[in-house]
């Protein structure tokens, strides 16, 4: 797996242990928690990152639970089951045998049940809406400059193909980034929009997953773009199945 050969680290994932014990003495990096080998030339899957996050010693964890604003992913952190490719398994269960179905970004999409709960397939999240509010500035950002800067960010920092950034909307102080990626559109080697959104979310919170890189310094024409709150909405290819009780709550 690609990794910086000189000091054997994983540029795209600091939640790894890297050692020169790969084939031919090459650097090999394994995700904390799962021990799965990761490709350090691209983003690590959200499932492996969550697993690594949960495996970190409690006293060493610098990470916090999702804020009260996370309206959709409101179950907080959990230790997920990942498949051999690092994707979320469709059914997740906790230590007390409570189970639920998740989508491809690991967000619960059914009511919780017991071990008899069936999740026939991993439903793909094909549309992600990232809703940001920026801190007050002297004036509004230029929409086209903001659009260009956010597209550049997703292309260069997260290696997401530009075609998957569907739109950037702006009505001061709210910025909305739309990511769209159908199953049929995603080719081998393409970064998943769910992974890109997760890296972005962690960057925005000042919890960068990149090794040794400075935190995210977002600027539009030299003006700092400082985010004060983030909401992320996930739309699945197949609508979620919640009971009416939850829907009316």
């Amino acid at each position: 797996h690609t990794a910086a050969q000189d000091n054997c680290t994983c540029p795209t994932n600091k939640m790894t242990v890297c050692s020169p014990d790969g084939p031919g003495g090459r650097c090999q990096c394994r995700a904390l928690g799962s021990g799965m080998a990761v490709d350090c030339s691209t983003l690590t899957s959200k499932c492996l990152l969550l697993k690594a996050r949960m495996s970190a010693p409690k006293n060493a964890r610098t990470l916090v639970r999702p804020s009260e604003h996370a309206l959709v992913d409101n179950d907080g952190l959990y230790d997920p089951d990942c498949d051999p490719e690092g994707r979320f398994k469709a059914r997740q269960c906790n230590q007390t045998s409570v189970c639920w179905c998740v989508n491809s970004v690991g967000v619960r999409r059914t009511d919780k049940g017991d071990l008899s709960l069936r999740c026939d397939e991993l439903v793909r999240t094909h549309h992600i809406l990232i809703d940001l509010r920026h801190r007050p500035t002297a004036g509004a950002f230029n929409h086209s400059d903001l659009d260009a800067e956010l597209r550049r960010l997703f292309r260069e920092r997260y290696r997401l193909h530009p075609k998957f950034v569907a739109a950037v909307h702006y009505e001061q102080p709210t910025i909305q980034i739309e990511l769209r990626q159908n199953t049929s559109q995603k080719a081998a080697g393409d970064v998943d929009i769910g992974d890109a959104a997760y890296y972005f979310e962690r960057d925005i919170k000042g919890e960068s997953l990149f090794q040794g890189r400075g935190g995210l310094d977002l600027r539009v024409r030299g003006e700092p773009l400082q985010v004060e709150r983030t909401l992320i909405y996930y739309l699945d290819e197949i609508p979620p199945k919640f009971s009416m009780k939850r829907l009316t709550a």
Epitope: S19, P23, S34, D83, P84
Partner: antibody, heavy 117, light 107 residues
Framework: EVQLVQSGAEVKKPGASVKVSCKAS????????INWVRQAPGQGLEWMGN????????NYNQKFKDRVTMTRDTSTSTVYMELSSLRSEDTAVYYC??????????WGQGTLVTVSS | EIVLTQSPATLSLSPGERATLSCRAS??????IAWYQQKPGQAPRLLIE???ESISGIPARFSGSGSGTDFTLTISSLEPEDFAVYYC?????????FGGGTKVEIK
């Protein structure tokens, strides 16, 4: 030549702890994972966990998580495996093994730990 | 955790015969499998890594194949010193796990 030399056999009483050492030579000690594998009499191989000597990152098999501690001393290129609250079923040969290229390439000679009252 | 199931548990063969040992993983592990030989009173010895890559110093009669969930160790023509227990082991993810072993005994 890569060598892993383990400490000698131990006899312990139930409830006690045992600390087995594994001294590495012939390669860069900090560059390769050291794993611990045990084998009860007449049984198969069981992975207990591993340690990466460069930064002391440890990863334990859930079965032993509350009882096992792996440490290292880079000055002597030695890794230690301590198992506490011993019971009779912990009677086994304990092996350390250097891991590279996705396999346990080099093994220590094994340390027999007998737990008996 | 990934469970490895080896079969048969015992294989009774004569020197010169071909031995075929199987190892099945509970989920797809690509080629992250290794094979070991263990003789009584000795530590295991690595024979094959990455499912099919031979280790220097290991006789050419030992070969491995397979990927995904089904793996095979083949000993093309058994020598007297090959009668031992053979284990498969996965390194796809932690916890690393071993199969229960296959004992190759003299018929």
């Amino acid at each position: 030549e890569v060598q892993l030399v383990q400490s000698g056999a131990e006899v312990k009483k139930p409830g006690a702890s045992v600390k087995v050492s594994c001294k590495a030579s012939g390669y860069t000690f900090t560059s390769y994972w050291i794993n611990w594998v045990r084998q009860a009499p007449g049984q198969g191989l069981e992975w207990m966990g591993n340690i990466y000597p460069s930064n002391s990152y440890t990863n334990y098999n859930q079965k032993f998580k509350d009882r096992v501690t792996m440490t290292r001393d880079t000055s002597t290129s030695t890794v230690y495996m301590e198992l506490s609250s011993l019971r009779s079923e912990d009677t086994a040969v304990y092996y350390c093994s250097s891991y590279r290229s996705d396999a346990f390439a080099y093994w220590g000679q094994g340390t027999l730990v007998t737990v008996s009252s | 955790e990934i469970v490895l199931t080896q079969s048969p548990a015992t294989l009774s063969l004569s020197p010169g015969e071909r031995a075929t040992l199987s190892c099945r993983a509970s989920q797809n592990i690509g080629t992250s499998i290794a094979w070991y030989q263990q003789k009584p009173g000795q530590a295991p010895r690595l024979l094959i890594e990455f499912a099919s890559e031979s280790i220097s110093g290991i006789p050419a009669r030992f070969s491995g194949s397979g990927s995904g969930t089904d793996f095979t160790l083949t000993i093309s023509s058994l020598e007297p010193e090959d009668f031992a227990v053979y284990y498969c082991q996965q390194s796809n993810s932690w916890p690393f796990t071993f199969g229960g072993g296959t004992k190759v005994e003299i018929k």
